[in-house]
């Protein structure tokens, strides 16, 4: 009976069975029912789903473009993934917004002890952060290399300058 | 040029390219180039995008094929980042926009993202970057010092 209000009397390409399949697969990836999955496991998870929610590998760039919210520890909430995948199937519509709201309300109400979570970044932002981090890291390693070469050059000159003193 | 890219990079670029090659004809439009690059973590300005297009879209037909795209990305990856680009990169981690990053945040970013620095490298980085030891890094000054010839 999951999401029966959201999908009631609907001939949409998404039905109750698809949501049940999502949660059945989710349980395998989140056996402790934390509601979160590590970003590093997301690619495997969405590849394991059945159509129409599945995003087959290679899917890393696709997942980046979904711009999923992430919380500290690079974890993603199951609802955010489900919303994004649902949106991929249904497209961006008023119906999608209504479905999302219904699903979210039902989910939160069904799990009243769970703490609300504050996303700090998204998959798209994280990719940008990765690229920016690499720029800084390469610049710093270049700087270290140049500095050690300068030191080596200085030591070399210094040792050769002093060699003719005898 | 493209032989300087790793297998992993080429696979990633291929995936991004294919994702936006909607009709599967092996080309993307120059309009889509920005979207493709953003999905790869790049944030090119309109002017930069135009320069890249001018370089690779020789016949000016408004489309780019994968080999051209690879060449373009390889050029972009090979270029040594300017002082301004490195400053921009730091700015991404400056959540308050006040010109400072905490040493703790810098350590976290440098050891967890990208081409991760070793503990020794990051210790040395923070020694150089947090000059007065107050736990805050003025990255403007640090970038100048790093890029000084």
């Amino acid at each position: 009976e999951n999401f029966n209000v959201a999908t009631e009397e609907s001939s949409e390409p998404l039905g109750e069975d698809d949501f049940e399949m999502f949660y059945e697969t989710w349980e395998k990836f989140d056996p402790d029912a934390t509601q979160f999955i590590a970003y590093s496991r997301l690619s495997d998870f969405v590849d394991t789903l059945q159509e129409p929610l599945r995003i087959a590998k290679p899917n890393k760039i696709k997942l980046i473009t979904l711009d999923l919210p992430m919380v500290p520890g690079d974890k993603i909430h199951c609802l955010d993934i489900l919303f994004a995948l649902t949106k991929e199937v249904l497209g961006d519509s008023g119906e999608m917004d209504a479905l999302k709201q219904t699903m979210e309300e039902k989910f939160m109400a069904a799990n009243p002890s769970k703490v609300s979570y504050e996303p700090i970044t998204t998959t798209l932002k994280r990719k940008h952060e990765e690229v920016c981090a690499i720029k800084i890291q390469r610049a710093y390693r270049r700087h270290l290399l140049q500095r050690s070469m300068k030191q080596a050059s200085y030591m070399y000159r210094h040792s050769h300058d002093g060699s003719g003193d005898d | 040029m493209a032989d300087q890219l790793t297998e992993e990079q080429i696979a990633e670029f291929k995936e991004a390219f294919s994702l936006f090659d909607k009709d599967g004809d092996g080309t993307i439009t120059t309009k889509e180039l920005g979207t493709v690059m953003r999905s790869l973590g790049q944030n090119p300005t309109e002017a930069e995008l135009q320069d890249m297009i001018n370089e690779v879209d020789a016949d000016g037909n408004g489309t780019i094929d994968f080999p051209e795209f690879l060449t373009m990305m390889a050029r972009k990856m090979k270029d040594t980042d300017s002082e301004e680009e490195i400053r921009e990169a730091f700015r991404v981690f400056d959540k308050d926009g006040n010109g400072y990053i905490s040493a703790a945040e810098l350590r976290h970013v440098m050891t967890n993202l990208g081409e991760k620095l070793t503990d020794e490298e990051v210790d040395e980085m923070i020694r150089e970057a947090d000059i007065d030891g107050d736990g805050q890094v003025n990255y403007e000054e640090f970038v100048q010092m790093m890029t000084a010839k």
């Epitope: 999951n2 989140d30 039902k106 989910f107 799990n111 703490v115 | -």
Partner: nanobody, 124 residues
Framework: QVQLQESGGGLVQPGGSQRLSCAAS????????LAWSRQAPGKQREFVAS????????YYSGSVKGRFTVSRDNAKETVYLQMNDLKPEDSAVYYC?????????????????WGRGTQVTVSS
């Protein structure tokens, strides 16, 4: 085994109040999320309210928010539903449900434990 027993239903006038109770046994009550759901004749069962084990505020459906209050007494292993300003459309069989708070479910329908229900009729 786990048992949930609702009580407190009956006939009440529009605008009146009623308090439902649900006594639980066979579970570690303090570790369980608890919910109230209702079903009117010919309609689907609908969520009314839920309360967790943490200090999170309870959840209410839009149709009862501001009129109904859910509460729990861990010592008495009982969950309550205080219903004020009752309307004829609140008439239904009211069910109590429970699940382990550490387990995540998609909707209230997935709660494993349910009571038999108590009838509330709002009529003049």
């Amino acid at each position: 085994q786990v048992q949930l027993q609702e009580s407190g239903g009956g006939l009440v006038q529009p605008g009146g109040s009623q308090r439902l109770s649900c006594a639980a046994s066979g579970l570690t009550f303090a570790n369980y999320d608890l919910a109230w759901s209702r079903q009117a004749p010919g309609k689907q069962r609908e969520f009314v309210a839920s309360i967790g084990v943490t200090r999170n505020p309870p959840y209410y459906s839009g149709s009862v928010k501001g009129r109904f209050t859910v509460s729990r007494d861990n010592a008495k292993e009982t969950v309550y539903l205080q219903m004020n300003d009752l309307k004829p459309e609140d008439s239904a069989v009211y069910y109590c449900a429970a699940k382990d708070a550490s387990v995540t479910v998609a909707t209230i329908e997935d709660y494993p434990y349910w009571g038999r229900g108590t009838q509330v009729t709002v009529s003049s």
